[in-house]
Amino acid sequence: LTCLGGFASPGPVPPSTALRELIEELVNITQNQKAPLCNGSMVWSINLTAGMYCAALESLINVSGCSAIEKTQRMLSGFCPHKVSAGQFSSLHVRDTKIEVAQFVKDLLLHLKKLFREGQFN
């Protein structure tokens, strides 16, 4: 997590700053949403537990051609210790449940804000 520089600052940033920046990006997405986010694309729901950053990325990486979430995808990759590619699935996916990207982002945002408030940055 010390290698998360480059999104909003030139050098490495503390984990709390990286998480705050991710939250702020998700807030931007939800607030600037005019038409359905990513044309209403559906993604696998995930369990918001340990390892959820990789799981979130694995879900969102399957959405292509949606510029609104490209920065989020890049930021999530900084929190995930392994390389994630399209079609990859983790046990954290709720494989029988698909939700719209907009709802996925909303749920993720709510959870990340609580992690930030509780001081859980990893």
């Epitope: 503390p14 709390s16 700053t17 998480l19 705050r20 918001l48 709510l110 959870h111 804000k113 609580k114 930030f116 408030r117 001081g119 940055f121």
Partner: antibody, heavy 120, light 112 residues
Framework: EVQLQQSGAELVKPGASVKLSCTGS????????IHWVKQRPEQGLEWIGR????????KYDPKFQGKATITADTSSNTAYLQLNSLTSEDTAVYYC?????????????WGQGTTLTVSS | DVLMTQTPLSLPVSLGDQASISCRSS???????????LEWYLQKPGQSPKLLIY???NRFSGVPDRFSGSGSGTDFTLKISRVEAEDLGVYYC?????????FGGGTKLEIK
Amino acid sequence: EVQLQQSGAELVKPGASVKLSCTGSGFNIKDTYIHWVKQRPEQGLEWIGRIDPANDNIKYDPKFQGKATITADTSSNTAYLQLNSLTSEDTAVYYCARSEENWYDFFDYWGQGTTLTVSS
Amino acid sequence: DVLMTQTPLSLPVSLGDQASISCRSSQSIVHSNGNTYLEWYLQKPGQSPKLLIYKVSNRFSGVPDRFSGSGSGTDFTLKISRVEAEDLGVYYCFQGSHIPYTFGGGTKLEIK
């Protein structure tokens, strides 16, 4: 309009238990934290604990551990405070409050308080 | 636990005077996320507490600008520049940085 509506006053006997409720309207309790605060007659405020209704993550002040149990029912948008083995020390006004919904920085709305009297 | 110590216990003032309430924490209340969750609440008789100041110095919406908060680390102050009758009541500082969260003992602002 955001509101927290608490249950009515209670008069209970020593040794009994009581369950107080706090129902949110105008917001979803899953989107925030609900806290409980105690105020004994003519005394200050004491934080009892809080619940994250989205995942039932609960934190207590250790001095209320065993005395207080905080729960939530998201289907009715209600948080509860159960107090057991009541003594005169538990006679107080109990408030619920919510953390504001942006960054959970502070308590922006409070319930009106529930007066609990423990007396034989 | 973080002990929050408020002084004075009682503060007699004349209307129009400045009032100052001090709150000292037994340890730093800077949260691991960098924020300092220090709040000030006012409780009037028979009412629920109401938020005045959050994160040390931010006025809550609708709070008059005669209220100001300052401080850092372990020392915090609430100032009321010109006390009005509606300001009377008990003021509490509160730290929401370290669980268990804790309130100060309260300061009663009353007419001299």
